[in-house]
Amino acid sequence: DAHKSEVAHRFKDLGEENFKALVLIAFAQYLQQCPFEDHVKLVNEVTEFAKTCVADESAENCDKSLHTLFGDKLCTVATLRETYGEMADCCAKQEPERNECFLQHKDDNPNLPRLVRPEVDVMCTAFHDNEETFLKKYLYEIARRHPYFYAPELLFFAKRYKAAFTECCQAADKAACLLPKLDELRDEGKASSAKQRLKCASLQKFGERAFKAWAVARLSQRFPKAEFAEVSKLVTDLTKVHTECCHGDLLECADDRADLAKYICENQDSISSKLKECCEKPLLEKSHCIAEVENDEMPADLPSLAADFVESKDVCKNYAEAKDVFLGMFLYEYARRHPDYSVVLLLRLAKTYETTLEKCCAAADPHECYAKVFDEFKPLVEEPQNLIKQNCELFEQLGEYKFQNALLVRYTKKVPQVSTPTLVEVSRNLGKVGSKCCKHPEAKRMPCAEDYLSVVLNQLCVLHEKTPVSDRVTKCCTESLVNRRPCFSALEVDETYVPKEFNAETFTFHADICTLSEKERQIKKQTALVELVKHKPKATKEQLKAVMDDFAAFVEKCCKADDKETCFAEEGKKLVAASQAALGL
């Protein structure tokens, strides 16, 4: 439905508070280096303009598109060329090319300082002094570091952030109350950002059809009692929401997400029996709750899939009449029966089924040709099952830190050209699959593990895309979205890699390591491990373990020494020499 003024329409739908927050997020995700104060000024100007349009939709410029209004505003930033270089060229373009240009310049790994958490009293004072600015700053700092963060969900995080400070800044022990809440928000935020990044990559790199297939599979698992027509409607609406958010249309996205939550709750009888509690919550909590809701129980007496998709005489007729609808039905029927499968596995099965029908429906005897198609699924199902079993056994044997180290070695040998910080970050996250998923019973392990690995490997893909260094990574990332994990799993040691020159500086440590948190200390050690493998890719597990054990003992010893810096200097030299000898460097 057309509105005379799009900006007035969205302002009225969302309300001033959400409107301002979403515009701030949008601007911070586009201009990631701009100071906070500059963004706040731009947002205030846009908000004042929106109010004039609410008062009179026929006022000057009120009929302009949001992209035109926001793009014009961003292009007024004085330091655009100095700060962003070629991104300033976007401003010479017309819409919609200008917005596409801004999108292409979003940086998944912006050169921004790490967020350091101030003392609790300092944070509480800042919160009490100016709550509005404090919360805006949170939105700004998260949005600029995570340019694809799902904007309506970031509003939910900000609401929880505010609640944490409101409660804890008046608690007897502020730190004990606040810090665990902030840690939880940080970890959940990183996970949420990575999940959304995969959705955007799916849409932008593989297209709407790929995203819709993912959504059909996931929603069919979650809402197995819903009819195919209902699932199809939800998929269409959800695709619109994510297309908008990934495209920078945050006001439309938030508005449409609210409409979708409303529709789901009004029709929960024909969607899922698990929605009742979610639907009693306020909007932001409701939308979050629906997105995380547990799978409903499967309907009674579902017939064998073979009846419709193998034994029926009409398989090729049904396929020819509407290929994507028939494949959608196959995916829906398979997924609702298999909450125990990962979404990516279900998509591989659907792709195999599609390939078989393409071949067989052109054959002399189609039924004879596709009669055994379900037999082809067996190895596809067993491969992730076996991989998860082996890796969970390894995780239970080693614990998280050493399991991460095993993955660091494995992935550095596969793709040694990738930067050390990226290998450390990605392998640490891959290693978290153990504590996240191995505790689950068999029926929940695969959807937990393989779909999580898809999210983590997408981080590798988007970071690598910024500065491509490995043809193998590019190949695994671009050939097939659903086969990324099997592609990386299948990679062996890269025999073409020329080992990195040894640099003693890389293995020189100082007393500052002693004051680091356990996590930071682990990262230092894991960085050294990656560098070791890059110098000596043929080193055995035993050799690497011996060197890492010596390294851990060296850090422990020097951190206990009276003169720590001297210890690190002298013992460090000895350790480097011993390690070189042990590895034959």
Partner: nanobody, 118 residues
Framework: EVQLQESGGGLVEPGGSLRLSCVAS????????MSWVRQAPGKGLEWVSS????????SYADSVKGRFTMSRDNAKNTLYLQLNSLKSEDTAMYYC???????????LGQGTLVTVSS
């Protein structure tokens, strides 16, 4: 607006046969599993059978298994129920409804009455 128009009922002797039809309109017929339910005089609704979207997969209540056969023609937006070896306890108003094995009450059409009596 969703419309389901049942027909084909009538008076039949025990052991006899009938074929019920249901013509659907106002929605994308082939995107829904469909079911037949019935209501005997003075009783509640009882599920009879269901059929998948494509039409190959079916499920039947124990009381009608082996006697009733459900089918659909998506090109004609029509659902069928073939009733064989009818018994007096099959006497009921028969309704077609959207959905597989519906466990939530759904709007019912006018139905078609099957009476089995000698």
């Amino acid at each position: 607006e969703v419309q389901l128009q049942e027909s084909g009922g009538g008076l039949v002797e025990p052991g006899g046969s009938l074929r019920l039809s249901c013509v659907a309109s106002g929605f994308t017929f082939q995107h829904y599993a469909m079911s037949w339910v019935r209501q005997a005089p003075g009783k509640g609704l009882e599920w009879v059978s269901s059929i998948s979207t494509v039409g190959g997969g079916t499920s039947y209540a124990d009381s009608v298994k082996g006697r009733f056969t459900m089918s659909r023609d998506n090109a004609k937006n029509t659902l069928y129920l073939q009733l064989n070896s009818l018994k007096s306890e099959d006497t009921a108003m028969y309704y077609c409804v959207r959905g597989w094995h519906p466990d939530v009450p759904r709007p019912l059409g006018q139905g078609t009455l099957v009476t089995v009596s000698s």
